[in-house]
């Protein structure tokens, strides 16, 4: 089938990095500068993506693959193929329509992106608060109050903080 197709369609012989040039009797011509073809048999080459402004070049365009962009410091990628750059905030903040705002009391964000999430409620697990939460850190839950009675021989290690919610990344 491949052999039959190549006899019928000379363009199928053109490899990636070239295009089938109708203006030159369908011979395979190299992609012009700033363009690429990632598959064989293409009749045109695609224009390379330009990483402009807040976008910086992670991988240069070649004749067979598009450029790849990421974001300049202070911003992070969103979307497929880093189609957007979103502003970072500081830990203890979240991005709102009015910019970066501090987490409300009782919530925290330990990353430069995402939303503020509620502190873990230790009492739901029958635990006590070992370390108070801050805007940047969740509370650390310790042993239950009963375990802290006088004469207890050892303190059990703090249970890992439960994930109270998941921030959309």
């Amino acid at each position: 089938f491949e052999r039959t197709r190549s006899l019928q369609d000379p363009c199928s012989n053109c490899p990636a990095g070239t295009f089938c040039d109708n203006n030159r009797n369908q011979i395979c011509s190299p992609c012009p500068p700033n363009s690429f073809s990632s598959a064989g048999g293409q009749r045109t080459c695609d224009i390379c993506r330009q990483c402009k402004g807040v976008f910086r070049t992670r991988k240069e365009c070649s004749s067979t693959s598009n450029a790849e962009c990421d974001c300049t410091p202070g911003f992070h990628c969103l979307g497929a193929g880093c189609s957007m750059c979103e502003q970072d905030c500081k830990q203890g903040q979240e991005l709102t329509k009015k910019g970066c705002k501090d987490c409300c009391f009782g919530t925290f964000n330990d990353q430069k992106r995402g939303i503020c999430r509620p502190w873990t409620n230790c009492s739901l697990d029958g635990k006590s608060v070992l370390v108070n939460g801050t805007k940047e850190r969740d509370v650390v839950c310790g042993p239950s109050p009963a375990d802290l009675s006088p004469g207890a021989s050892s303190v059990t290690p703090p249970a890992p903080a439960r994930e109270p919610g998941h921030s959309p990344q």
Partner: nanobody, 121 residues
């Protein structure tokens, strides 16, 4: 045809001032934010300041707070970056971009070519 064009750059002594302009054409200026970025030789590009379509400002760089301010004149389709108490480390190519929102830039946003600012005695 969409265009952004920066102007107002030049050579200035430390402690001096400059006002950069970003003039826009070919799109509905009032609907867009305008963000200023800069790139110093051998350094990463960094965000400086942005003004939203409604006129609110967002500082991207703490180092310019108290020294740089941003304003817009929608009648002239122009945004101004007023820079005072300039320091040698402010030397860079300054360029403006036009996102819909100061907090989020898209790969198809418009950008100007930039204007050179040199702070030196």
């Amino acid at each position: 045809q969409v265009q952004l064009q920066e102007s107002g750059g030049g050579l200035v002594e430390p402690g001096g001032s400059l006002r950069l302009s970003c003039a826009a054409s070919g799109f509905t200026f009032d609907d867009y934010a305008i963000g200023w970025f800069r790139q110093a030789p051998g350094k990463e590009r960094e965000g400086v300041l942005c003004i939203s379509s409604s006129g609110g400002s967002t500082y991207y760089a703490d180092s310019v707070k108290g020294r740089f301010t941003i304003s817009r004149d929608n009648a002239k389709n122009t945004v101004y970056l007023q820079m005072t108490n300039l320091k040698p480390e402010d030397t860079a190519v300054y360029l403006c971009g036009a996102p819909r929102d100061c907090s989020r830039y898209s790969s198809d946003d418009y950008w100007g070519p930039g204007t050179q600012v040199t702070v030196s005695s």
